[in-house]
């Protein structure tokens, strides 16, 4: 009990519990494959505790190892649609700073209409994560079908 | 080492490490799309540390942000079966209290026989999570094919 | 700030933050369905903090409940290939000690070329995790397409 009380007196940030869960805002203009995200209690169950959004992209504020997860469902999609519009691919990566640019997670839809995955990866303060959806299909904006999040795991 | 000893003297509950991993018990009667879960060391590798089961549904005991994850595999299934019985959909949501009812996670099987996903979401003490499987196909009860769990991440 | 300083003076190991993220090294010889993994900063974004690799298999060093996650993408794969070579199955399990041998996670590819999932499971010091890919298709070695990791969650 004593520890629990002490814990409450400390700002959560000092414990390194950075976490964010985002919902889709919109897709990018032509030639921009990025998905643009939004988050905050006014929008429902999305939130940012530590990380920030920079023009719809997620920016990391604390160095560490993070669990990155994503689910994207294609709108107006059937297995026939998905295979006809193949390849539709989702990639999550560090897009800035350019010196750290790298693809972290990549999935193709093939005959499915949803991809979901997660991975552990080291991220540094200032890293911006981009999620690129290539292909002609649009993602669903339903908050239980398309979402993207990170969770700080350890230094 | 001193800290580690101190940590062991504290009940884990005070650290907020609520966690549960459940295995499928059975499906509901007709007109009840819910999956009914079970957990505990006597059943194998499933467990509940904090959350509880209420008539096969998972009830949360501690406020916080949770990582919710699920995998469901359809029994006696091939891609042909899955597409013939489409739409088969799995939804995870808060089903009680009614005032907080919301779908958190939704996936369709399309031509696949397994769905798996995860997301971060705020949950409150007393929230009961339900997993609804709609369609005519039955889920596999194999513990390595169908499971559902939550992990407390931060306040 | 005081707590953060104190935290830095403690070895992270005493906090139980064991974590690993691995990339595919190679597949096994004929009749050996195991995938062989590698990890370390020299290899890119893979790492081992606590767990160790034993002949390409992941060995646990700390008792506890772990989040185990995996993504495997088949190389040179289309939905047609995947269905023609069905069944291709990925299983993650404890393969040693033999007394604790059990399958933890199992997925079939059906008409898809990627599987991804995660689950919570109790693991003990000395448990070795094996990932068995059965079928004739080969996994992609791209680090953003095929990876395997564990994260210690609680005692």
């Amino acid at each position: 009990q004593r520890f629990a009380q002490a814990q409450q007196q400390l700002p959560l940030e000092s414990l390194g519990w950075d976490v964010a869960e985002l919902q889709l805002n919109h897709t990018g203009p032509q030639q921009d494959p990025r998905l643009y995200w939004q988050g905050g209690p006014a929008l429902g169950r999305s939130f940012l505790h530590g990380p920030e959004l920079d023009k719809g992209q997620l920016r990391i504020h604390r160095d560490g190892i993070y669990m990155v997860h994503i689910q994207v469902t294609l709108a107006i999609c059937s297995s026939t649609t998905a295979s006809r519009h193949h390849p539709t691919t989702l990639a999550v990566g560090i897009c800035s700073p350019a010196s750290r640019s790298i693809s972290l997670l990549r999935l193709s839809f093939h005959q499915g209409c949803t991809i979901a995955s997660q991975r552990l990866t080291p991220l540094a303060r200032g890293d911006t994560l981009c999620t690129n959806l290539t292909g002609t299909l649009l993602p669903s904006r339903n908050t239980d079908e398309t979402f993207f999040g990170v969770q700080w795991v350890r230094p | 080492q001193r800290f580690a000893q101190a940590q062991q003297q504290l009940p884990l509950e005070s650290l907020g490490w609520d966690v549960a991993e459940l295995q499928l018990n059975h499906t509901g009667p007709q007109q009840d799309p819910r999956l009914y879960w079970q957990g505990g060391p006597a059943l194998g590798r499933s467990f509940l540390h904090g959350p509880e089961l209420d008539k096969g549904q998972l009830r949360i005991h501690r406020d916080g942000i949770y990582m919710v994850h699920i995998q469901v595999t359809l029994a006696i299934c091939s891609s042909t079966t899955a597409s013939r019985h489409h739409p088969t959909t799995l939804a995870v949501g808060i089903c009680s209290p009614a005032s907080r009812s919301i779908s958190l996670l939704r996936l369709s099987f399309h031509q696949g026989c397994t769905i798996a996903s995860q997301r971060l979401t705020p949950l409150a003490r007393g929230d009961t999570l339900c997993t609804n499987l709609t369609g005519t196909l039955l889920p596999s009860r194999n513990t390595d094919e169908t499971f559902f769990g939550v992990q407390w991440v931060r306040p | 700030q005081r707590f953060a300083q104190a935290q830095q003076q403690l070895p992270l190991e005493s906090l139980g933050w064991d974590v690993a993220e691995l990339q595919l090294n190679h597949t096994g010889p004929q009749q050996d369905p195991r995938l062989y993994w590698q990890g370390g900063p020299a290899l890119g974004r893979s790492f081992l903090h606590g767990p160790e690799l034993d002949k390409g298999q992941l060995r646990i060093h700390r008792d506890g409940i772990y989040m185990v996650h995996i993504q495997v993408t088949l190389a040179i794969c289309s939905s047609t290939t995947a269905s023609r070579h069905h069944p291709t199955t990925l299983a993650v399990g404890i393969c040693s000690p033999a007394s604790r041998s059990i399958s933890l996670l199992r997925l079939s590819f059906h008409q898809g070329c990627t599987i991804a999932s995660q689950r919570l499971t109790p693991l003990a010091r000395g448990d070795t995790l094996c990932t068995n890919l059965t079928g004739t298709l080969l996994p992609s070695r791209n680090t953003d397409e095929t990876f395997f990791g564990v994260q210690w969650v609680r005692p």
Epitope: H26, T27, P29, G44, R141 | - | -
Partner: antibody, heavy 119, light 107 residues
Framework: EVQLVESGGGLVQPGGSLRLSCAVS????????IHWVRQAPGKGLEWISY????????YYADSVKGRFTISRDNAKNSLYLQMNSLRDEDTAVYYC????????????WGQGTTVTVSS | DIQMTQSPSSVSASVGDRVTITCRAS??????LAWYQQKPGKAPKVLIY???SLQSGVPSRFSGSGSGTDFTLTISSLQPEDFATYYC?????????FGPGTKVDIK
């Protein structure tokens, strides 16, 4: 049959209030986001409000923000629009419209209810 | 807010004609565009969503195309029941906005 039926329109004085309802049948109401759209006499369509399936996300057009309140009761399959501080320019036919399941387009519309603001 | 413009504002055509209506967004909206048909005294009816997807039950003579800022609704062979007003709507970002409408009447 999928149906949305608006009610509650009528004549009201400037500054007055009115509560519109939209009763839904033929589909699972709680699975859909809903919009209110209006159309002034002889004019085009104007989107005015949106509510998500669980009421967790709500948006308003600037023209009604602070005066109108959208709400829903999933147990009663009903949507509402509380309109306060009404102005002459709020005179219109008000439609409720179901959001496409995965998209922000309106795939089913009600027949509309007329609101007239006049002294 | 995103402004939507339509042209022409009205068009006179005969049964069997090919009719093309264009819609322009003030900024890129990817494919987040829908087309609606409205007849006098009736509620609007969706024809096309996601710029080019035909709504179930809508005749195949209606088609949509475009992406970014420029979009087109085409009626390949005008039928008597197609005389109506057509609106485009962007669903890229809130607040949603409609075009001013294009009235298709009998020549």
């Amino acid at each position: 049959e999928v149906q949305l039926v608006e009610s509650g329109g009528g004549l009201v004085q400037p500054g007055g209030s009115l509560r519109l309802s939209c009763a839904v049948s033929g589909f699972t109401f709680s699975n859909h986001n809903i919009h209110w759209v209006r159309q002034a006499p002889g004019k085009g369509l104007e989107w005015i409000s949106y509510i998500s399936r669980s009421s967790s996300t709500i948006y308003y057009a600037d023209s009604v923000k602070g005066r109108f309140t959208i709400s829903r009761d999933n147990a009663k399959n009903s949507l509402y629009l509380q309109m306060n501080s009404l102005r002459d320019e709020d005179t219109a036919v008000y439609y409720c419209a179901r959001d496409h399941a995965q998209w922000y387009g309106m795939d089913v519309w009600g027949q509309g209810t007329t609101v007239t603001v006049s002294s | 807010d995103i402004q939507m413009t339509q042209s022409p504002s009205s068009v006179s055509a005969s049964v069997g004609d090919r009719v093309t209506i264009t819609c322009r967004a003030s900024q890129g909206i990817s494919s987040w565009l829908a087309w609606y048909q409205q007849k006098p005294g009736k509620a609007p009816k969706v024809l096309i969503y996601a710029a080019s997807s035909l709504q179930s039950g809508v005749p195949s003579r209606f088609s949509g195309s475009g992406s970014g800022t420029d979009f087109t609704l085409t009626i390949s062979s005008l039928q008597p029941e197609d005389f109506a007003t057509y609106y485009c709507q962007q669903a890229f970002s809130f607040p949603f906005t409609f075009g001013p409408g294009t009235k298709v009447d009998i020549k």
